[in-house]
């Protein structure tokens, strides 16, 4: 197989891999028929003129995780067949002009995780066949107009994790084939109107973790093919009424971690394909009627960790496919009895960490498929008779950390809980708060030593007498579907994010396995 440097391994199928700290220069002689060359984890600090001159058949060249800080302009001369070039995870601060000249077949160029301070239009002017350009994890502060003008075939551009403070509205104007644009983790404060107008084929736009305060009303109006829009962890305080009007293909929208105070009716939609909407960690105080009515296919709605104190009875109109509703950690004191009536397919509802004092008896009347209800850490003293009677699929009910009043009125609830103990889990049981003589005792086994007027305790209580013991619980308490970990950084369906910080604060989050955003 045409000779192989001692510090490399070569396959007979034209592949070469050179790794190790003892390598300080490109090994020679490289097999002339090499198609794939990897130079990884070495101490190479520079690439001189034409080190690959004799391997013109090369298709893939990965020079990654080295000490590379300097490249001569002619380093890649004679690599006309090269289609994939990665210089990721090195120490490059400057790219010489003309470095990629002659790489007429180049389709993928990875320059991520270096220390690049700037790029110029001349850098990529020869790369007319480029499909993928990765520039994330550098120190870029601005992108000059014209930088990408020659890359008309580009489908994926990643500029995340840089130091961009502003974007020119003209910088992407010639990228009509672009499908993925990532600008996450920069310092963008606003995005000019028209910036994305030329991106008619865009499918994913990642703008999370910037400092964007305001969205222009027509910012996305030309992006009819957009499927994934990430706007989380910015400073957005309001949404212009028409900002999401032209996004019929959108199936994922993240808005968590912003400063949204209100949501106006019709702001979302029509978005017939949207399955998940993430709005946690905002400052929303109320939900008006029909605010989500355009989202007919929505399955997950996360409104936790806001300041919601009022929900209009028709706020959830139209959400007939909703499976998961998270309202925990808000300021709710009361709920209208009809507020969940339209949610016929709801399976999980999180209402913990609010100020709920009571629940209407019909609150879950039409939500027959409920499997998990989180009501812990509220101000509940009792619950209406029969509130859970019709919920045959209920396998997780959390009632602890409420000020239960254990007088004679609690008996029907106590009896029902006694018969349905498996639903309560084993982590924490509800305990009495009053009267003082029973404070801290388990509500399930409490002995109510008071005269019980017959009016309060019917011969046949409304709570079902038949115990519900599932053979195999759908949601074992150790991995409760409504108590699993929520990620603090979104998993945005791509693998360029290198780290995801995880918090396991089960008492706060109360989210499901679907909620990884």
């Amino acid at each position: 197989y045409h000779g192989c440097p001692s510090e490399c391994t070569c396959s007979r199928a034209s592949q070469v891999e050179c790794t190790g700290a003892r390598i300080v220069a490109v090994p020679t002689p490289l097999p002339w028929n090499a198609m794939s060359l990897q130079i990884l984890n070495t101490h190479i600090t520079e690439l001189n003129e034409s080190p690959f001159l004799n391997i013109s058949a090369l298709i893939a060249l990965r020079i990654e995780k080295n000490e590379l800080s300097r490249i001569t302009p002619g380093a890649f001369r004679n690599l006309g067949s090269l289609r994939y070039l990665s210089l990721a995870n090195n120490k490059l601060q400057v790219l010489p002009i003309g470095l990629f000249q002659g790489l007429d077949s180049l389709e993928s160029l990875l320059l991520s995780s270096n220390q690049l301070l700037q790029i110029q239009p001349a850098h990529f002017s020869q790369c007319s066949n480029l499909k993928e350009l990765q520039l994330h994890g550098n120190h870029l502060e601005y992108i000059p107009d014209g930088a990408f003008d020659h890359l008309v075939g580009l489908t994926k551009l990643n500029l995340g994790k840089n130091s961009l403070t502003h974007i020119s509205p003209r910088v992407f104007q010639h990228l009509g084939n672009l499908q993925v644009l990532r600008l996450y983790e920069n310092r963008l404060t606003d995005i000019p109107m028209g910036t994305f107008d030329g991106l008619v084929n865009l499918q994913e736009l990642a703008l999370q973790q910037n400092q964007i305060g305001l969205l222009s009303p027509g910012l996305f109006h030309n992006n009819h093919n957009l499927q994934r829009l990430y706007l989380s962890n910015n400073h957005i305080s309001q949404l212009p009424p028409s900002v999401f009007m032209q996004l019929p293909q959108l199936n994922r929208l993240t808005l968590f971690g912003n400063s949204l105070k209100e949501l106006s009716p019709g702001i979302f939609g029509p978005m017939p394909n949207l399955r998940e909407l993430w709005l946690y960690d905002n400052h929303i105080s109320s939900l008006p009627d029909n605010v989500f009515s355009n989202l007919r296919q929505l399955q997950v709605l996360i409104l936790s960790r806001n300041q919601i104190s009022f929900i209009s009875p028709g706020a959830f109109n139209g959400l007939t496919e909703l499976r998961e509703l998270s309202l925990h950690t808000n300021a709710l004191q009361d709920l209208d009895g009809n507020v969940f009536r339209m949610l016929a397919n709801l399976q999980n509802i999180s209402l913990q960490n609010n100020r709920l004092r009571q629940l209407p008896g019909n609150i879950f009347a039409n939500v027959n498929g409920l499997m998990a209800i989180q009501l812990q850490n509220n101000q509940l003293e009792n619950l209406p008779l029969g509130i859970f009677d019709h919920l045959g699929k209920l396998c997780e009910l959390r009632l602890y950390d409420n000020p239960w009043r254990c007088d004679s009125d609690i008996l029907p609830l106590r009896n029902w809980l006694l018969l349905n103990q498996p639903r309560l889990g084993t982590d924490t049981v509800p305990v009495c708060f009053s009267p003082a003589n029973v404070r801290g005792q388990s509500l399930i086994i409490i002995n109510v030593n008071v005269a019980v007027p017959s009016v309060h305790v019917p011969e046949v209580p409304s709570y079902p007498e038949t115990p519900w013991y599932p053979d195999t619980p759908s949601y074992p308490d150790t991995t409760s579907v409504s108590s699993t970990t929520e990620l603090t950084s979104p998993v945005e369906d791509y693998t360029d994010l290198t780290t995801i910080q995880v918090t396991d604060d089960r008492s706060v989050w109360g989210m499901t396995q679907a909620q990884s955003g």
Epitope: T9, S11, R12, A13, Q15, E17, M35, S36, Q38, I59, A60, R62, S81, R83, Y84, S86, S105, E107, S108, K131, G153, T155
Partner: antibody, heavy 120, light 107 residues
Amino acid sequence: QVQLVQSGAEVKKPGASVEVSCKASGGTFSSYAINWVRQAPGQGLEWMGWIDPKSGDTTYAQKFQGRVTMTRDTSTSTVYMELSSLRSEDTAVYYCASGGSYSPWYFDLWGQGTLVTVSS
Amino acid sequence: DIQMTQSPSSLSASVGDRVTITCRASQSISSWLAWYQQKSGKAPKLLIYAASSLQSGVPSRFSGSGSGTDFTLTISSLQPEDFATYYCQQAYSFPFTFGPGTKVDIK
């Protein structure tokens, strides 16, 4: 993201030829080789050869030399595999597969498979 | 041609079990080896390349090791979705060859 989409199932008689197509959709032609791998019912995987979609260069496994022809049409981003002089033991699912950026020969992208049945 | 053999040809295991599959090449192939998972009626899926590198998107419970002629695929804690057939493949020289497969089913 690129997908490899193959043509539909075929039923052929012994001695005939069959042509299976593999189209790159949702993106461009693979940066690497398109390989063909077959799997007889209840059996393992067998590599047949590869074609470079840009240059048209091919390498065939010795076992199929003279019976297999791999071609490509760059205008439609499609590669073709033709197998001639079919016999019953050629009944199999035929997959096209493409390598990733690390190496052309680790197949990280596969077509859905095309069942070819050879029966008299 | 380089022959690839796998053992065992089949095994029964339970969810949570640690599962090890071995692959042997008839001559040294350095680290030019891949592991694939195939479920009934589906195309194979790349799990491990270069003997030990985890393919993007594959759960970390899968790991590979070995060099030269002897290689191992390990599933640290078997999950319900892992019941499938596993193949090794040498990428060292033409023609590329696959092992005969190891079927992992439920005990």
